[in-house]
């Protein structure tokens, strides 16, 4: 309808006596601005006056002038939108309708409003979700249709008259739409809360009571349970009965079916609110409980655990490792099933005692091949002594122990001899698989840990072996001492330092670089004739006839070695020169005549010089003297001289004969 | 036989700690057990700790958890480290030898050949 005015307000507002009342308004004239307004309490039409007839409480007029009485009332609107009213305080008397008379220039509206006072503070409203179920957050709400800016106001919740931790949320609104206050609390129920009264309490700004509204919490939950135990420790022998029984502290709503449940598994036919165990077994050892259900769900109670107390069953041995190193670290473990647990242990390594070992583990820090064999154990608790378990073995590897290199031959071995070396050792973990041998030689190894050296050297001196599992273990070298004749003999010159001469003093050693074994005797040889037994063979005068091919040898008891042969060279003057005449002493003159200088010489002569019967030396310096022709003033005695390093030697006259011709003396 | 010179003994309040040593003349390890033991006044003497080459222990059960027996090879010495000590530990402390003849023949309660002439450890509460 067009010709309306258009208000907006909430219908109908709540509030008490002393408190206060904000009335939130909107509104649009059909024309123009406002030019008056009356508030009216309980209005009613005058149709004589055609005006409104009843109690003023609030006016302006057109000089805008407001009465000193009218304080309590206050429009705080405006002259076209805002129409919002505020009465402060408020009576009882108040309670009704309230008019707003709305006045423009050429049109009149009446606007009506209800206010409801009551005498005291009303209570809130507590809303609750449909269903509350345990654990699950729920929003508990409290709703009050009031809120004035002139009266603050405070809801608190209280849960069995206490005040609940749990923050609360407030909201106010002051709206055209609404007006209320409102507090929510987020809160998530135990099944404990069942049946417990929620409070909802209005206070004033000084937290003084004003009004309440109260609930009662119906929490769903599961069924909650106790369990209880003969005997109350739950530590039973075997043999010994045992009683739980199951009961029901709180159900919402009733329970429907029982069982009991061990280790989490359900026992078969136990659907009683009591369970009894009787001569029970260790295998009955375990964590028991009850679970009853409803529509909720089921409920569980605390677990029980049933201890079925026995003597140590056999026990069995751990260990940390087996195979071990030698050196390394190893531990024992002892196990044995015991309820209580064993408080004593006794160890055995194979079958024997381990003195003063009586804890649940054995720690061997370094390892030692004796350590090896069977280990059992004993466990003891209250109830008794278990029995010996079948043991464990412990295997100790190590390298090859106390390697030795043997020699089968006979002693004493000799350059050439075949020997025959074995690689021995004491002990062995896992088993020696193969053997090393120092030095390497292409010796042959006839069988394992056996080597054979054909044609032995005389300087093999030293062999190790090494007996090999996963690791190697050599031996101490051991000395083949092999005997030999003497080595490397030779011919040394001690003295002269330098070349020999005829009259010399000589010394010739006789050297060898070595001999096992080292007696020796010496034998020194010329031509195959012997000249002597000592290491020196000494010449006090040296002479020509001394020269020539010398030799020495060394022997010991296994052999004898000769030196080469080494040429003793004298040096001497030329020495029994003689002239030898060719073709002979007498020759025919015209033929041809040859005198020869013969001599001994060391060095061979180098320079020869003649002479004639007149001891004239003659124009000729070779060894051969040629006279051709010749001629019967040849004839005469000759002698010749011959010169080396050493000196010079004469020879003793030679006479040459030259008889004439047959033409010579047939001419005379 | 070897001879063996106890050190590190004296006198400490209850709760507190003491390290003795046990210097041997000649080189142990890997041929001999070696231990500990003490005699207070009036009393026999008792084992207290062993170890043997191997590094096994075994330890009196009144000592257990608090005393401790190790071996310095190089130092050619034994130790006993005593923490939590009580008056009832008051004692002479004694080092003790023997041949290491058979693996697990190491214990307190063994017959030892060579002896230490002893260190006086006292406790006062």
């Known amino acids: 309808d067009s010709s309306k005015w258009v208000f907006e307000h909430p219908e109908t507002l709540y509030a008490w006596e002393g408190a206060c009342v904000w009335i939130p308004c909107t509104y649009r004239a059909l024309d123009g601005d406002l030019e008056s307004f009356i508030l009216f309490h309980n209005p009613e039409y005058n149709k004589n006056t055609s005006k409104f007839d009843g109690t003023r409480l609030y006016e302006s007029t057109k000089d805008g002038k407001v009465p000193s009485e009218q304080k309590r009332v206050q429009f705080l609107g405006d002259k076209n939108k805002n129409c919002t009213l505020s009465i402060h305080p408020v009576h009882l008397n108040d309670s009704g309708q309230l008019g707003l008379r709305m006045e423009s220039k050429t049109e009149k509206w009446m606007e009506r409003i209800h206010l409801n006072v009551s005498e005291r503070p009303f209570p809130p409203h507590i809303q609750l979700p449909p269903e509350i179920q345990e654990s699950q957050e729920v929003t508990l709400t409290c709703l009050l249709n009031f809120s004035c800016y002139g009266y603050p106001i405070q809801l608190q919740w209280l849960l069995e008259g206490v005040p609940m931790r749990q923050a609360a949320v407030t909201s106010t609104s002051l709206t055209i739409k609404s007006v209320f206050t409102r507090s929510e609390l987020k809160f998530s129920p135990q099944w404990s809360h069942h049946g417990k009264i929620v409070t909802c309490q209005l206070q004033d700004a000084d937290g003084k009571f004003l009004s309440n509204d109260t609930v009662q919490l119906n929490v769903k939950h599961t069924p909650k349970l106790e369990i209880k135990v003969t005997p109350s420790d739950a530590i039973v022998r075997e043999g010994d009965s045992v009683t739980m029984t199951c009961e029901v502290s709180s159900s919402n709503p009733e329970y429907t079916t029982v069982s009991w449940l061990k280790d989490g598994t359900s026992l078969k036919k136990q659907n009683t609110f009591t369970l009894n165990l009787r001569e029970v077994t260790k295998d009955q050892s375990g964590k028991y409980c009850c679970q009853v259900s409803n529509d909720v769900g089921p409920g569980r109670s605390e677990e029980v655990f049933l201890q079925v107390q026995y003597a140590p069953e056999p026990s069995t041995v751990q260990i940390l490792h087996s195979p071990a190193v030698e050196g390394s670290q190893v531990e024992f473990l002892c196990m044995s099933l015991a309820n209580p647990l064993p408080t004593n242990y006794t160890w055995y390594h194979n079958g024997k005692e381990m003195q003063g070992r009586t804890e649940e583990k054995v720690h061997i820090p370094k390892i030692l091949p004796w350590h090896a064999g069977t280990y059992s154990c004993v466990a003891e608790n209250i109830l008794g002594t278990g029995q010996r378990g079948p043991g464990a073995e412990l295997d100790v590897q190590y390298p090859p122990k106390k390697v030795t290199t043997v020699i089968q031959n006979p002693m004493p071995i000799r350059e050439g001899d075949t020997v025959t070396l074995s690689c021995n050792y004491n002990s062995s973990n896992p088993s020696v698989t193969r053997y090393e041998w120092k030095p390497h030689g292409a010796w042959e190894e006839p069988s394992l840990g056996v080597l054979k050296i054909q044609n032995v050297g005389w300087d093999n001196t030293t062999i190790a072996c090494a007996a090999c599992n996963s690791w190697c273990s050599w031996a101490s070298p051991v000395a083949l001492n092999v005997q030999y004749a003497p080595r490397d003999v030779r011919v040394r010159k001690i003295k002269p330092l330098s070349e020999i001469h005829s009259g010399n003093s000589v010394s010739l050693q006789c050297d060898f670089s070595s001999s096992h074994p080292k007696e020796v005797q010496f034998f020194w040889e010329k031509n195959g004739r012997l000249l002597g037994k000592e290491s020196q063979l000494n010449f006090d005068s040296i002479s020509p006839e001394d020269a020539g091919s010398y030799s020495c040898w060394v022997n010991n008891s296994i052999g004898q070695t000769a030196s080469k042969a080494w040429t003793l060279e004298v040096l001497y003057a030329p020495r029994r020169l003689r002239v030898s005449m060719s073709p002979g002493d007498q020759v025919m003159e015209g033929k041809s005549a040859t005198l020869t200088c013969e001599s001994d010489a060391n060095p061979p002569v180098s320079h020869y010089t003649w002479f004639d019967w007149n001891n004239q030396s003659l124009p000729y310096h070779s060894q051969k003297l040629r006279l051709e022709p010749v001629k019967v003033q040849h004839s005469g005695a000759y002698w010749c001289q011959g010169t080396n390093s050493v000196g010079k030697g004469r020879s003793p006259l030679s006479t040459l004969t030259v008889y004439y011709s047959p033409e010579t003396i047939g001419r005379r | 036989q070897i001879q063996l010179v106890e050190s590190g003994g004296g006198s400490v309040q209850s709760g507190g700690s003491l390290r003795l040593s046990c210097k041997a003349s000649v080189y142990t390890w890997g041929t001999y057990c070696m231990g500990w033991f003490r005699q207070a006044p009036g009393k026999e003497r008792e084992g207290v700790a062993t170890i043997d080459p191997a590094g096994t222990t075994t330890y009196a059960n009144s000592v257990k958890g608090r005393f401790t027996i190790s071996d310095d090879n190089a130092q050619n010495t034994l130790y006993l480290q005593m923490n939590s000590l009580r008056p009832e530990d008051t004692a002479m402390y004694y080092c003790?030898?023997?041949?290491?003849?058979?693996?697990?023949?190491?214990?307190?309660?063994?017959?030892?050949?060579?002896w230490g002439q002893g260190t006086q450890v006292t406790v006062s509460s």
């Open positions: 003790a030898a023997r041949a290491y003849d058979a693996p697990w023949a190491c214990w307190t309660g063994a017959v030892f050949r060579d």
